[in-house]
Interface confidence: medium
Amino acid sequence: SIPWNLERITPPRYRADEYQPPDGGSLVEVYLLDTSIQSDHREIEGRVMVTDFENVPEEDGTRFHRQASKCDSHGTHLAGVVSGRDAGVAKGASMRSLRVLNCQGKGTVSGTLIGLEFIRKSQLVQPVGPLVVLLPLAGGYSRVLNAACQRLARAGVVLVTAAGNFRDDACLYSPASAPEVITVGATNAQDQPVTLGTLGTNFGRCVDLFAPGEDIIGASSDCSTCFVSQSGTSQAAAHVAGIAAMMLSAEPELTLAELRQRLIHFSAKDVINEAWFPEDQRVLTPNLVAALPPSTHGAGWQLFCRTVWSAHSGPTRMATAVARCAPDEELLSCSSFSRSGKRRGERMEAQGGKLVCRAHNAFGGEGVYAIARCCLLPQANCSVHTAPPAEASMGTRVHCHQQGHVLTGCSSHWEVEDLGTHKPPVLRPRGQPNQCVGHREASIHASCCHAPGLECKVKEHGIPAPQEQVTVACEEGWTLTGCSALPGTSHVLGAYAVDNTCVVRSRDVSTTGSTSEGAVTAVAICCRSRHLAQASQELQ
Amino acid sequence: QEDEDGDYEELVLALRSEEDGLAEAPEHGTTATFHRCAKDPWRLPGTYVVVLKEETHLSQSERTARRLQAQAARRGYLTKILHVFHGLLPGFLVKMSGDLLELALKLPHVDYIEEDSSVFAQ
């Protein structure tokens, strides 16, 4: 009988009477920026070092009574969730606490910045093993706080933050909106998003994943043997910080990009009821609940990919949206999506020496999203091959012509506002899997990659009758790198990857006749790396 | 943490100094920007993070902070440097009147300035 939250993050092979997964994150140091803590609590005694760092604003109200147990409440609980003896995730992790929140749980952006700087200086003075920084706090969007998080992440530190408890788009808050930070939303025992009074967990494209965050039992600062149940995205973030500590302890050389990809890969998929989120946020919000990997080693052979959504382009005619991968990731494909269906496609382009995915709005469109498929592909050499609009009626096509390069994704982009609603679909000739085919008035972009042992194949699923959604998934052992719709289906709203499934969305079927125009084909490019598989076998 | 506006023992009312010139005026065409929290109740006007360009050294940060104090003093404003950042971002934290923002944005090396704001336990 273990608390529901520890059971939820534990893969079945660990589940015994007690939650005791192998190695408790002992090689990792977790920094906690929060309230003061009760370091002599039975749960965390000897596990948490209270640093002398303190930068907090005065408490509000002249009659505020500073009571130690109240001041320590939030931080003590979170320290317990990360590394508590009985109710912690990473029981072996050591922690250091910095006080940046006052007795009312309030701090400042400047105080948090100075705290992050303190961590960086400590890291330089005394380099230790992997560092995880837990930021169980949120304020309004802050350019400077996000920038500081980016710098610290680029110094090799893993930052985990609360998505926020405002039942709102996490991109409006910091540090939740910082792309380099792992941003965590909260779910409950029923895998539903957490409601907190009239508000609840934040959501949207800036959330990386969800974790248990309701009725989480942990150390209470009322006494050294007391426990309390608390709820919030802080608690969810603490779970992920604990999982990260476990993963880094098992594989100390993991980069932030590798860690994030593993967190996503080992999460429970599609268990959250998306109806809780506002309709326009459902497609953007990851349906992932964090879990520990089933074994601490041996994940290296897999080709890991994740989907990154851009911010909304806005409705102006020439508006564009850009989705970017993390520095250590490869952009293997690029797609776009518009709720109105009015878009001018997408293209992969170089920006600052790195490929980005840019989507284009169309006249009368409400705006577009760019969707990047970002993958971990060591020693990869990727390039984009472009074919301009063709004159021929067969449509535009482009393939990977370099020796050893394989097709990982197809994009198409057109200058005209409307690709001609009444033109029949152009079907890709069979037996030519290594090429992208598009509408004759579109330019087509093929993402071609060379990497040791990389092999890819194309998988299609076509539905003759109109459907709001067509999907095609990659089989076990293969990873989805590219997702697009076959050209000619002008009512397609766009295509995007959800885990290992390619989703092509169309306009409401009631507005579309059941002619050949209704036909929708989803095209998935599925890849695997034999090189990574061999490397991991050699390690074992 | 500093007291309310009463605690000004470190506030500088500097005389005009050689620092207070325009020798290092910002490069032509690059304008520093000002940012503040979109959620009004969370704003903390009167405290600002002045972020300097990426490659700015600590000595330049300190010089820029002193220059701001000197120029502000010439206009009759008290300012207080609360912290000089280095290690993550170059810059400094300053307690000053919002009236001085225009002046501060014109200082050399300044990338952007952000008004301080509140963060909350989640």
């Epitope: 209470s220 050294s224 309390v228 | -």
Partner: antibody, heavy 131, light 106 residues
Framework: QVQLVQSGAEVKKPGSSVKVSCKAS????????ISWVRQAPGQGLEWMGG????????NYAQKFQGRVTITADESTSTAYMELSSLRSEDTAVYYC????????????????????????WGQGTLVTVSS | DIQMTQSPSSLSASVGDRVTITCRAS??????LNWYQQKPGKAPKLLIY???TLQSGVPSRFSGSGSGTDFTLTISSLQPEDFAVYYC????????FGQGTKVEIK
């Protein structure tokens, strides 16, 4: 209000073991919130151990470590305390006591506390150890 | 372990008297202290928790105070049914009880 009803008196030989039960009735039984406290004749109260109110992991007083085992059976709403290697000084009344739960609200997000505050007690079980 | 020392170990008082029992912890325990009343042949009964909060159903003549290491139980006007043994119990560490204070009729 939960009533705790304990098993009857026992007479045991030194070196043997005793297992005392504590059944909850009326209200919801929380097997994770039971401690055992003993009282030797004419003496004070002594906490022996309890089921950790959070994880269901037993927590024992240093003095009894290795000799006492506390378990709980959710299906029958019964908690058990087994004391081994009995000696004459173990002659005492053994009480089961339920930890108290209170509703609170701080940061608008806390739900309840569980702690070693013994709000309801069993009637006691006299265990006599004699050769 | 945290030691709890009660004083006095016994006291004689009359109905209507104000009675004070003190309890000292061997180290600071915040407000993590409870007071119990026990009558002969019966199980203890919770009177005060968290140092000063009256358990529901307990007469208001009972009150508790103190925090850190020194705590007090006060009976403002002793009633016939109050003659019993009183125990303090800390729960900041593993629970430990004081040795008890016996309140007898003078």
């Amino acid at each position: 209000q939960v009533q705790l009803v304990q098993s009857g008196a026992e007479v045991k030989k030194p070196g043997s073991s005793v297992k005392v039960s504590c059944k909850a009735s009326g209200g919801t039984f929380n097997s994770h919130a039971i401690s055992w406290v003993r009282q030797a004749p004419g003496q004070g109260l002594e906490w022996m151990g309890g089921i950790n109110p959070i994880l269901g992991i037993a927590n024992y007083a240093q003095k009894f470590q290795g000799r006492v085992t506390i378990t709980a059976d959710e299906s029958t709403s019964t908690a058990y305390m087994e004391l081994s290697s009995l000696r004459s000084e173990d002659t005492a009344v053994y009480y089961c006591a339920r930890h108290y739960e209170i509703q609170i609200g701080r940061y608008g997000m806390n739900v309840y506390y569980l702690m070693y505050r013994f709000a309801s007690w069993g009637q006691g079980t006299l265990v006599t150890v004699s050769s | 372990d945290i030691q709890m020392t009660q004083s006095p170990s016994s006291l004689s008082a009359s109905v209507g008297d104000r009675v004070t029992i003190t309890c000292r912890a061997s180290q600071g325990i915040r407000s993590a202290l409870n007071w119990y009343q026990q009558k002969p042949g019966k199980a203890p009964k919770l009177l005060i928790y968290d140092g000063s909060t009256l358990q529901s159903g307990v007469p208001s003549r009972f009150s508790g105070s103190g925090s850190g290491t020194d705590f007090t139980l006060t009976i403002s006007s002793l009633q016939p049914e109050d003659f019993a043994v009183y125990y303090c119990q800390q729960f900041d560490g593993d629970p430990t009880f004081g040795q008890g204070t016996k309140v007898e009729i003078k």
